[in-house]
């Protein structure tokens, strides 16, 4: 059994998350994850889910009763989601920590917007794009 | 020229984001995006970047001077990043809107943690993967 399971059970006790009423009104994440089979789509959704858990854990980081559990789970997320790649994890954390109300951050974000947009579609690179047209007869967008 | 370019230039004026000092102290997003070539890694990072822009746009949604620009850019993100898939966009927005300080949300999140973790690695569900291939016979970005 993965070590995170025991620690997640500990968190369940701490948050009273084992109570039957917790399942009322559907799931937060599980139904959404079931909608997406394609790896890149799953990463879009999981990225938001992981950042949610990181924020949640940050809010409880000083609580000694669950500190070990939180650390174990974060470590397992690091292994499973970031493939133990510290640079990937660090870049991700940088992105999640930018303050949307900081005027310098706002200006930088708007300054970079055109280049960010140009890279958003999977077929952003010209060579790749031509190839994808051949295979798909896809939308004549443009 | 993509219509978003003109609207992004309009936003630059509004935020004074064309000033030379904006480039000081490195980039927010561009250097990070340059680090990641693999599609699934890019999606992890772009997911955070897109949610940042959505939050930024939300904060300025009532400003008439940039409303058209913001809506054009959001539409283009919808086309490029979500492949005009409303369900993908809706699921993404649900995830970004969960409040990490709401105790009911916290309990649900902890309740779902074990199952979320089990699905985090790309090869989490071999059986499911095989089955999803049956329905696809293609590389489709669903």
């Amino acid at each position: 059994q993965d070590p995170y399971v025991k620690e997640a059970e500990n968190l369940k006790k701490y948050f009273n998350a084992g109570d039957p009423d917790v399942a009322d009104n559907g799931t937060l994440f599980l139904d959404i994850l079931r909608n997406w089979k394609e790896e890149s789509d799953r990463k879009i959704m999981q990225s938001q889910i992981v950042s949610f858990y990181f924020k949640l854990f940050k809010n409880f980081k000083d609580d000694q009763r669950i500190q070990k559990s939180v650390e174990t789970i974060k470590e397992d997320i690091n292994v499973k989601f970031f493939n133990s790649n510290k640079k990937k994890r660090d870049d991700f954390e940088k992105l999640t920590n930018y303050s949307v109300t900081d005027s310098n951050v706002q200006r930088k974000a708007v300054h970079e917007l055109i280049q960010v947009m140009a890279e958003l579609s999977p077929a952003a690179k010209i060579g790749k794009r031509k190839r994808s047209q051949m295979f798909r007869g896809r939308r004549a967008s443009q | 020229q993509d219509p978003y370019v003109k609207e992004a230039e309009n936003l630059k004026k509004y935020f004074n984001a064309g000033d030379p000092d904006v480039a000081d102290n490195g980039t927010l997003f561009l250097d990070i995006l340059r680090n990641w070539k693999e599609e699934s890694d890019r999606k992890i990072m772009q997911s955070q970047i897109v949610s940042f822009y959505f939050k930024l746009f939300k904060n300025f949604k009532d400003d008439q001077r940039i409303q058209k620009s913001v809506e054009t850019i959001k539409e283009d993100i919808n086309v490029k990043f979500f492949n005009s898939n409303k369900k993908k966009r809706d699921d993404f927005e649900k995830l970004t809107n969960y409040s990490v300080t709401d105790s009911n949300v916290q309990r649900k999140a902890v309740h779902e943690l074990i199952q979320v973790m089990a699905e985090l690695s790309p090869a989490a569900k071999i059986g499911k993967r095989k089955r999803s291939q049956m329905f696809r016979g293609r590389r489709a970005s669903q």
């Epitope: - | 219509p3 539409e75 086309v79 329905f135 669903q142």
Partner: antibody
């Protein structure tokens, strides 16, 4: 009240052209994507083309082989479909339908509103 | 081709329940919204279910939509059948190139 009114249909010879129009009212046209759908006599619904509201992304059914062109004029609250090299298989009622707000501001529902349709007959 | 396959026709007596299936041939049913339309003879298509399960205002709660990922299909269920339910019903979804796809339609006859 949302209204979509198609016009421009009629009888045309094979190889000919037609331009269909769809006049929209009762909603902020410039915020919504729009669609054309057709229905041949006694047959099912067939999607023809779609266009986003602000970014001019255009989508076409593969079967059209580049013969049709969708466009819109947000100042006139109108959607158009330019149809060239028409064949008898293009004979159908052509419906205009409202899409959703692809910026997500006030999303709406795809295909919630349809016009009454305009009949295009291709015959020699 | 991203076909959506529907039965050609279904029939049932008033008061009974019918289910019309819509099976996706390629792609994953849950990854795109499914809509259902009712079209009476000579009429314009009218949306009766949107976004998989949602009902527009004015559509009776006898009509419901669902998704079944195990069969990669969507279903439209009409309970307490009435004569005015007699019509053609079409499912509709999307493919990965943002093309709209319609099912072939199902003719519902109320006996």
């Amino acid at each position: 009240e949302v209204q979509l009114v198609e016009s421009g249909g009629g009888l045309v010879k094979p190889g000919g052209s037609l331009r269909l129009s769809c006049a929209a009212s009762g909603f902020p046209f410039s915020r919504y994507s729009m669609h054309w759908v057709r229905q041949a006599p006694g047959k099912g619904l067939e999607w023809v083309s779609s266009m986003t509201s602000r970014t001019n992304h255009k989508y076409y059914a593969d079967s059209l082989k580049g013969r049709f062109l969708i466009s819109r004029d947000n100042d006139r609250d109108s959607l158009y479909l330019e149809m060239n090299s028409l064949g008898v298989e293009d004979t159908a009622i052509y419906f205009c339908a409202r899409g959703y707000d692809t910026s997500g501001s006030d999303s709406g529902v795809d295909f919630q509103y349809w016009g009454q349709g305009t009949l295009v007959t291709v015959s020699s | 081709n991203f076909m959506l396959t529907q039965p050609h026709s279904v029939s049932e007596s008033p008061g009974k329940t019918i289910t019309i299936s819509c099976t996706r041939g390629r792609g994953y049913i849950a990854s795109y919204y499914v809509q259902w339309y009712q079209q009476r003879p000579g009429g314009v298509p009218k949306i009766v279910v949107f976004e998989d399960t949602q009902r527009p205002s004015g559509v009776p709660d006898r009509i419901s939509g669902s998704i079944d990922t195990s069969t990669n299909s969507a279903s439209l269920t009409i309970s307490g059948l009435q004569t005015e339910d007699e019509a053609d019903y079409y499912c509709q979804s999307y493919d990965d190139a943002n093309h709209v796809i319609f099912g072939g339609g199902t003719k519902l006859t109320v006996l």
